[in-house]
């Protein structure tokens, strides 16, 4: 499998809401021992691998902002933590999973990463991120909505797995 | 903050199984993995096997046919059985939260079993 | 199971000095390595994820570095609290496995 990201930059005004999405791609197993973990996180395009790094969004860490599951089953966050910090990461039954951030700040600008791992139990992990970058503004030139940019499709559909 | 602690007895009989509970507090045990590790007294450590939050368990091939791990949720604990201990069984014994793709960021503090007659 | 291999076994050095810290892999682990550090009566304290990232609140004088079958922790300045065991740790496949540890003690 691998994951997609529908749009590899995201232009708001300070204050706005926006909701960052990712989507699993291919065929996903449901088997017993087959389970999902997938997490959102701020990195910065390394020089060895862009997304290797994680650091927090608003102070909540991936193992905060993590979901789990087996397949393609709904689910969501913890509330209470991430909802006071106006954050929530949910996922759906088709694939597509997303963190959406309330109350724009220009701190919160920067590469933001999504991370998918398929547990096979018994035999390994695999895992595959996505990237995309979220700018921002304030002032007479920020859009008075969310400007989203498609990605590529070689790079939505370039994603490192490992 | 996440904890763990261990607990169980410091000492059993060869042949007998080792038992030791992990407790889980301030956090939820309704996720990662919950792992155990060794380290024999002067050694390196090594990984016992995990329990996911989801039931799921995972042994490392050296033990697997004498161990065990279970989870109780509601307690917010997991366990350890290890059946046939021998000398060679004597370790200190870690409990650790281990994140998918991450690393084991949280251990216990380790608690002595010592294996004698 | 991948085997990890770590030298030197002992490492002397002085406060200040620089501490390098090999680890070998038997087969690639691709950047899924891990670096611990256990001073005596404690538990291991994760220090670097996937070869090169810190964790949270450990000092910048740690450092990871390569990728495949060969490692580095290096340590640019010991300070006296960094004299410990330090493990490193590979989770590309199960069964996860640890490295035989390389103490670094005071010269």
């Known amino acids: 499998f691998k994951v997609a990201t529908p749009y590899s930059l995201y232009v708001c005004p300070e204050g706005q809401n926006v909701t960052l999405t990712c989507r699993l791609l291919g065929p996903v197993d449901k088997g017993h021992d087959v389970t999902f973990y997938k997490t959102w996180y701020r990195s910065s395009r390394g020089e060895v691998q862009t997304c290797s790094e994680r650091r927090p969004i608003r102070n909540l860490t991936f193992q905060d902002l993590h979901l789990h599951h087996g397949g393609h089953q709904a689910a969501n966050t913890s509330h209470d933590l991430a909802q006071r910090h106006g954050l929530e990461s949910a996922s759906d039954h088709h694939g597509n999973f997303s963190i959406t951030m309330r109350n724009l700040t220009l701190l919160d600008s920067g590469l933001y990463c999504c991370l998918v791992v398929e547990i096979r139990h018994h035999h390994s992990e695999h895992r595959v991120h996505g990237a995309m970058e979220l700018q921002v503004q304030t002032g007479k030139d920020a859009p008075s909505n969310c400007v989203v940019y498609p990605s590529s499709s070689q790079d939505s559909e370039n994603i490192t797995a490992a | 903050q996440v904890q763990l602690q261990e607990s169980g007895p410091g000492l059993v009989k060869p042949s007998e199984t080792l038992s030791l509970t992990c407790t889980v507090s301030?956090?939820?045990?309704?996720?990662?993995?919950w792992s155990w590790i060794r380290q024999p007294p002067g050694k390196g450590l090594e990984w016992i096997g995990y329990?996911?939050?989801?039931?799921?368990?995972n042994y490392n091939p050296s033990l697997k046919s004498r161990v065990t791990i279970s989870v109780d949720t509601s307690k917010s604990q997991f366990s350890l059985k290890l059946s046939s201990v021998t000398a060679a069984d004597t370790a200190v014994y870690y409990c650790a939260r281990d994140i998918p793709a991450f690393a084991f960021d949280i251990w216990g503090q380790g608690t002595m079993v010592i294996v004698s007659s | 199971e991948i085997v990890l291999t770590q030298s030197p076994a002992t490492l002397s050095l002085s406060p200040g000095e620089r501490a390098t810290l090999s680890c070998r892999a038997s087969?690639?682990?691709?950047?899924?390595l891990a670096w611990y550090q256990q001073k005596p009566g404690q538990a291991p304290r994760l220090l670097i994820y996937?070869?090169?990232n810190r964790a949270t609140g450990i000092p910048a004088r740690f450092s990871g570095s390569g990728s495949g079958t060969d490692f580095t922790l290096t340590i640019s300045s010991l300070e006296p609290e960094d004299f410990a065991v330090y493990y490193c740790?590979?989770?590309?496949?199960?069964?996860?496995?640890f490295g035989g540890g390389t103490k670094v003690e005071i010269k």
């Open positions: 740790q590979q989770r590309i496949s199960w069964p996860l496995t």
């Open positions: 329990i996911y939050y989801s039931g799921s368990t």
């Open positions: 301030g956090g939820s045990i309704s996720s990662y993995y």
């Open positions: 996937d070869a090169f």
């Open positions: 087969q690639s682990v691709n950047y899924y």
